[in-house]
Interface confidence: low
């Protein structure tokens, strides 16, 4: 980009340096070079000379016109051909930007990950604006009516210690950039209703040799929440379809879940939990692989998981909470 250049003239953009993508724009260049009546004025975009749509307005000024400008950023500069000068002389340069005003932020959501000490608020920003867009998160206590504001470029972590106005709040988001400003609807939250339990982790698996061999999955969470509902999903690594089991869980001890699986097949497991009856789920836990033996008992522990990675595996998924893309968290 153009930051600090020594200008011998002026360059400007109509309607503005930052404008709505797809607009027609005009870039004007006016030379002010000592002892130079320019023979010709040239425009460059990102270092490449423009050949078309240049109009000479008067002795010192020219205009470059673009129809339907779609580039998010461009560095423009112009030069003059001066008599008795071997090289073109730089007049000036300018960075231009095109983009969109922000959409109304929607789907504002706030969650507290257990032990994080923060309330994480996120929203759907809408379509890409291409230009610098800031967000102001407003948090207003419904008990004290005190309002706090937080400036951010994306999501925000708000320390729960700073939420001194009781348990009930209104949260809304304002989005603003050079092309406009929008405000979301207000979200009403109760701090006790938005806690996501500490992550559930699968620690090991073992297959017990019996008349019908069974696999036991050991899993745990550090949560202090008493009533927790969990889901475990599993599938053969060669399959696309997951099986889902549901559990009502008390994490005072390590959980043991039994599965009757096919022998000599590599399986993948994941688990996630939520506070029973509440809205938000944990992200799915990291992939845990276990290969069932042909006949001999086998134990797979977390420490050896890197050895069991199958680089050819495609973990395709659903974000119903029953399959998720790229193992991303599904909080809905």
């Amino acid at each position: 980009g153009i930051t600090n250049i020594n200008c011998s003239g002026h360059i400007w953009v109509e309607p503005a340096t930052i404008f709505k993508m797809g607009m027609n724009i005009s870039i004007y260049c006016q030379a002010a070079i000592k002892n130079c009546q320019p023979r010709k004025l040239h425009f460059y975009k990102n270092g490449i000379k423009e050949r078309f749509q240049i109009t000479r307005i008067n002795k010192t000024t020219a205009r470059l016109w673009y129809k339907n400008f779609l580039e998010p950023h461009a560095s423009m500069y112009c030069t003059a051909e001066c008599p008795k000068h071997f090289q073109e002389t730089l007049i000036c340069g300018k960075d231009i930007s095109s983009g969109y005003p922000p959409d109304i932020p929607d789907e504002v959501t706030c969650v507290i990950y257990e032990y994080s000490g923060n309330m994480t608020c996120t929203w759907n920003a809408g379509k890409l604006t291409y230009i610098d867009t800031k967000y102001v998160v407003h948090v207003k206590s419904l008990e004290t009516e005190e309002e706090q504001q937080y400036l951010t470029s994306s999501y925000i972590n708000i320390s729960t210690d700073s939420l001194q106005g009781g348990k009930k709040y209104l949260v809304w988001v304002q989005a603003a950039n050079a092309l406009g400003m929008e405000e979301s609807k207000q979200l009403q939250i109760h701090l006790d209703d938005i806690v996501i339990p500490s992550a559930a982790v699968i620690s090991r698996a073992e297959t017990i040799n019996a008349t019908v061999p069974k696999t036991i999955i050991y899993w745990d969470s550090q949560t202090t929440i008493e009533k927790v509902s969990c889901e475990m999903r599993y599938k053969a690594t060669t399959n696309q379809t997951w099986n889902v089991k549901e559990f009502d869980t008390n994490f005072t001890y390590v959980q043991q879940s039994e599965f009757y699986l096919e022998p000599n097949i590599k399986y993948v497991f994941q688990v996630r939990c939520q506070e029973t009856g509440k809205r938000y789920w944990q992200p799915w836990s990291s992939l845990f692989f276990h290969k069932t033996p042909e006949t001999v008992p086998q134990v797979t522990s977390k420490a050896f998981q890197h050895d069991t990675w199958n680089s050819g595996l495609t973990v395709a998924s659903i974000s119903t909470g029953h399959l998720t893309s790229d193992n991303r968290g599904d909080i809905g």
């Epitope: 959409d103 929607d106 789907e107 959501t109 969650v111 994480t120 996120t122 929203w123 759907n124 920003a125 809408g126 379509k127 994306s154 999501y155 696309q240 379809t241 809205r279 992200p283 395709a316 998924s317 659903i318 974000s319 119903t320 909470g321 029953h322 399959l323 998720t324 893309s325 991303r328 968290g329 599904d330 909080i331 809905g332």
Partner: nanobody, 121 residues
């Protein structure tokens, strides 16, 4: 805001079939997958099946091999084909949008109003 409308419920004899539909309308910037849940009288709502936008499916053990989930993207509709129905399949069936989430984009889920399925022996 997304609206969901279920249809296709009804009464059927054990061993019979029904096809439920879940039609989604309303525009959102979030990408959603669709899940079916059911709730028997006096019981909690339970997951039945789900389908992602790329067609990958998920089923509860209790319906695997009997139920098939599918989608028609052109019609914004997801179907649940229920075969070999059992009396224990009797419940109100709900569809739900499930958002694909990242830390910078958590989207709201939406529920439909439900459609009743009754299986008699």
């Amino acid at each position: 805001q997304v609206q969901l409308q279920e249809s296709g419920g009804g009464s059927v004899q054990a061993g019979g079939s029904l096809r439920l539909s879940c039609a989604a309308s309303g525009y959102t910037y979030c990408n959603y997958d669709i899940a079916w849940y059911r709730q028997a009288p006096g019981k909690e709502r339970k997951f039945v099946s789900a389908i992602a936008s790329d067609g990958i499916t998920s089923y509860a053990d209790s319906v695997k091999g009997r139920f098939t989930i599918s989608q028609d993207n052109a019609k914004n509709t997801v179907y649940l084909q229920m075969n070999s129905l059992k009396p224990e399949d009797t419940a109100m069936y709900y569809c739900k949008t499930d958002p694909i989430s990242t830390i910078t984009r958590i989207c709201d889920p939406y529920w439909g109003q439900g459609t009743q399925v009754t299986v008699s022996s």
